[in-house]
């Protein structure tokens, strides 16, 4: 299996930003996406049977979606850093997706405002 | 208790459509892939189709000699899965088992009774 | 698709016997993807392997599964009365998904 994601990402103070991954080549069966920050802090889980849990600490900043993808919002200087999605999947394990975001100040933004929510 | 309870089949003439039934009940539903699996003397066990999870994006997969005649469906506020036939055939005929798997940590396979399909003119 | 060849395709064995039943994929199958089924006559088919070798719940441990790429085997170390039934390989490795055509296991 691959997990493809967004890659290396820029958004502006301030804004929102898609964080997407996606696992193909295997006919595993997703059973949760977790969805963690760069100091290893959870944000968010996608279960196969319980559905959606967005963490205490993000629920104003976080949205779930589109699809096993996560939304953040209201997005400060702090929020640049890594982000990772790992899928559990059966019977093949977990698969596991890096993200790198860097959030620009609204100026140098403008150049950069390819993943950018408008 | 895990109980899958298939219903909808019987006799049809060959041309002819069918839609086939499956109510879960014991398990969480919808953290389960579900299978349609068919059974007859002439061609023993044939997977159908299956319908994956929301997580799986509701993903649906057919066996080649169903492809563009059957839809599988589903809808988890009912705990149930359907197979829609169309354009039956002769061949189409044998007991159909509905199939549900889930892991949550340990893996779970469970299986209806059956239903019946005959086509036959 | 990957086509699942079991043999033999009816055997009868002796209680206390060990029982050997194969299945030979027509390409490489994944280990974890696959199965094998119990059935008993008039009855609808029971996980009884999976994983290649994970015995699913209730399985008497005198079970056994093992294989790789395109050669599997379900073992029984000592043939009771209750094993008699149908045994079928599945594999969801790659589509379509098939099954072996059974082994029929009798009681001599």
């Known amino acids: 299996g691959t997990i493809e994601t967004t890659g290396n990402i820029s958004a502006k103070k301030g804004g929102s930003v898609i964080l997407q991954c996606h696992l193909s080549s295997t006919m595993a069966q997703v059973t949760q996406v977790n969805w963690e920050q760069h100091d290893h802090s959870l944000l968010a889980i996608r279960n196969a049977e319980l559905g959606w849990h967005i963490y205490p600490a993000f629920k104003d900043r976080v949205a779930p979606g589109p699809g096993l993808g996560l939304t953040l919002q209201s997005l400060t200087m702090n929020d640049t850093g890594e982000y990772f999605c790992t899928y559990h999947t059966y019977p093949d394990g977990t698969y596991r997706g890096r993200i790198f975001l860097e959030v620009l100040e609204s100026s140098v933004a403008e150049h950069s405002a390819r993943f950018q929510i408008p | 208790e895990v109980k899958l309870e298939e219903s909808g089949g019987g006799l049809v003439q060959p041309g002819g459509s069918m839609k086939l039934s499956c109510v879960a009940s014991g398990f969480t539903f919808s953290g389960a892939w579900m299978d349609w699996v068919r059974q007859s003397p002439e061609k023993g066990l044939e997977w159908v189709a299956e319908?994956?999870?929301?997580?799986?994006?509701?993903?649906?997969n057919y066996g080649e000699s169903v492809k563009g005649r059957f839809t599988i469906s589903r809808d988890d506020s009912k705990s149930s899965v359907y197979l829609q036939m169309n354009n039956l055939r002769a061949e189409d005929s044998g007991i159909y088992y509905c199939?549900?798997?889930?892991?949550?940590?340990?893996?779970?396979?469970?299986w209806g009774q059956g239903t019946t399909l005959t086509v036959s003119s | 698709q990957i086509v699942l060849t079991q043999s033999p395709a009816i055997m009868s064995a002796s209680p206390g016997e060990k029982v050997n039943l194969t299945c030979s994929a027509s390409?490489?199958?994944?280990?974890?993807?696959l199965y094998w089924y119990q059935q008993k006559p008039g009855s609808s088919p029971k996980l009884w392997i999976y994983g290649t070798s994970t015995l699913a719940s209730g399985v008497p441990a005198r079970f056994s599964g093992s294989g790789s790429g395109t050669s599997y085997s379900l073992t029984i170390s000592n043939m009771e009365a209750e094993d008699a039934a149908s045994y079928f390989c599945h594999q969801w490795s790659s589509f379509p998904y098939t099954f072996g055509g059974g082994t029929k296991l009798e009681m001599k």
């Open positions: 319908i994956r999870t929301k997580v799986n994006n509701h993903a649906t």
């Open positions: 199939r549900g798997a889930l892991y949550d940590g340990f893996y779970f396979d469970y």
């Open positions: 390409s490489s199958v994944s280990s974890g993807y």
